[in-house]
């Protein structure tokens, strides 16, 4: 029972985590304009992995995709790759873990096969979570570096008369979503790996022991009077019921190019 609960919980936690990783990857707020120097700006900039956006105080939001691949920073490409790898691994892990769930019966699948599948999905979730955490952390590090660089040359004056303020960017909501989601996927993966240990059938062979009683030549098999109780042919002791795998349609909404707030 505890094994089933651990496996089920691991699956649910991982599912939430992977949904979060997908959401974070699609989000536009990976970096947002730092408002420390101008908290009442009429133009607010924010950037994602795929496009950069500008929200005017008028309510108009304009987003422009990064239509170049070669012109993008290598770090951004690396973050994209890490997040995509994380999503792909997580998605495969989810698929594998659905079939590995103890509460779902597929044909005459052995517990050993389910244990292996649980372990495989668990490892996939762990790697997926690590990819997401790594991707988000690389991006955060890039932001911190750029932040202090732009702070160093925040104002460049033209003869001390005209000020040109350089836009600084700070952590966006997507980073926090990514960190939490990556952590959840990681925890879910660990739970799956723990569940795997409980799912693996015991390898101990219980050999029949002969007890010679005086005057009788009767061999007693451990397990009592019924051969099928406990240790007999029915060693699996399966809990059987049909658990339907549910799939939820996730709709990712994007701000339109003419989005009045």
């Amino acid at each position: 029972m505890a094994v089933t609960a651990c496996q089920g919980l691991g699956f649910v936690v991982s599912l939430i985590g992977i949904a979060g990783i997908i959401a974070a990857t699609c989000m536009d707020q990976w970096s947002t304009q730092d408002l420390y120097n101008n908290p009442v700006t009429a133009v607010f900039n924010y950037q994602g992995l795929w496009r950069s956006c500008v929200r005017e105080s008028s309510g108009f939001t304009e987003c422009r995709g990064y239509f170049t691949l070669l012109g993008l920073p290598a770090m951004l490409q690396a973050v994209r790759a890490l997040m995509i790898v994380g999503i792909v691994l997580g998605a495969i892990g989810l698929l594998v873990s659905i079939f590995a769930l103890k509460c779902i019966r597929i044909g005459s699948m052995e517990d050993s096969a389910k244990a292996n599948m649980t372990l495989t999905s668990g490892i996939m979730f762990i790697v997926s979570g690590l990819c997401a955490i790594a991707g988000v952390s690389v991006f955060a590090n890039m932001l911190v570096t750029n932040f202090w660089m732009s702070t160093a040359n925040m104002y460049t004056g033209m003869g001390g008369m005209v000020q040109t303020v350089q836009t600084r960017y700070t952590f966006g909501a997507a980073l926090f979503v990514g960190w939490v989601a990556g952590g959840l996927t990681l925890i879910g993966g660990v739970m799956m790996c723990i569940a795997c240990r409980g799912l693996a059938p015991e390898e101990t062979n219980y050999k029949a022991v002969s007890y010679h009683a005086s005057g009788h030549s009767v061999a007693y098999k451990p397990g009592g009077f019924k051969a099928s109780t406990g240790f007999g042919s029915n060693t699996k002791n399966k809990k059987i019921y049909d658990g339907g795998a549910r799939t939820e349609d996730e709709v990712q909404s994007y701000p339109s190019k003419h989005d009045y707030v």
Epitope: V40, A42, V43, N45, V54, S57, F60, E62, R64, Y260
Partner: antibody
Framework: DVQLVESGGGLVQPGGSRKLSCAAS????????MHWIRQTPEKGLEWVAY????????YYADTVKGRFTISRDNPKNTLFLQMTSLRSEDTAMYFC???????????WGQGTLVTVSA | DIVMTQSPSFLTVTAGEKVTLSCRSS????????????LTWYQQKPGQPPKLLIY???TRESGVPDRFTGSGSGTDFTLTISSVQAEDRALYYC?????????FGTGTKLELR
């Protein structure tokens, strides 16, 4: 057709109060940020206050902060400017304006004159 | 606050002439996020409210004659009227649309001979 009509102007004594209204029609009022802008022959155009479509954020010019309050009633398509502790320098023609692309004002009302004098 | 300076204050021209109105800001109005300049031009005729001519420094508002052209970037901007007509006699204002408080220039009064 987009229309903005201001009302509530008039002669006020220094230290007195006045509430200006701006009735909007011809567009989805709840979808736009709105402003009050004033004009005097001496100072020219001066931005006074801004209110976003959902009433937050709200911004004021330093000259009116703490004395003026901008508000809106979306179901009634009306913008307000509550003016208190009025000074002679607040004497101006007050316009309401609709916020548009590029943080510009694409439609203005005809204005309402507020005169602060003893 | 961003200070907007317009020059000249007064301008008298002949109909059909090309006119250039200047506007300078104390701080750059160029937004790095979308590479747009947040500067707006308005025209105000006597007894009327201001009318929007150009936003984003060079985008002409619908219904505005194409003789009106906005240009410039960063801190220096110009409004050009290619061939002045009698109905262009008005006050022209530039506005900082980049940060609050939204500030206006002192205006340029265009007169016709």
């Amino acid at each position: 057709d987009v229309q903005l009509v201001e009302s509530g102007g008039g002669l006020v004594q220094p230290g007195g109060s006045r509430k200006l209204s701006c009735a909007a029609s011809g567009f989805t009022f709840s979808g736009f940020g709105m402003h009050w802008i004033r004009q005097t022959p001496e100072k020219g155009l001066e931005w006074v206050a801004y209110i976003s479509s959902d009433s937050r954020p709200i911004y004021y010019a330093d000259t009116v902060k703490g004395r003026f309050t901008i508000s809106r009633d979306n179901p009634k398509n009306t913008l307000f400017l509550q003016m208190t502790s009025l000074r002679s320098e607040d004497t101006a023609m007050y316009f309401c304006g609709r916020f548009y692309y590029g943080n510009s004002f694409d439609h203005w009302g005809q204005g309402t004159l507020v005169t602060v004098s003893a | 606050d961003i200070v907007m300076t317009q020059s000249p204050s007064f301008l008298t021209v002949t109909a059909g002439e090309k006119v250039t109105l200047s506007c300078r800001s104390s701080q750059s109005l160029l937004n790095s996020g979308n590479q747009r300049n947040y500067l707006t031009w308005y025209q105000q005729k006597p007894g009327q409210p201001p009318k929007l001519l150009i936003y984003w420094a060079s985008t002409r508002e619908s219904g505005v004659p194409d003789r009106f052209t906005g240009s410039g970037s960063g801190t220096d901007f110009t409004l050009t009227i290619s061939s002045v007509q009698a109905e262009d006699r008005a006050l022209y204002y530039c506005q900082n649309a980049y940060s609050f408080p939204l500030t206006f220039g002192t205006g340029t009064k265009l007169e016709l001979r």
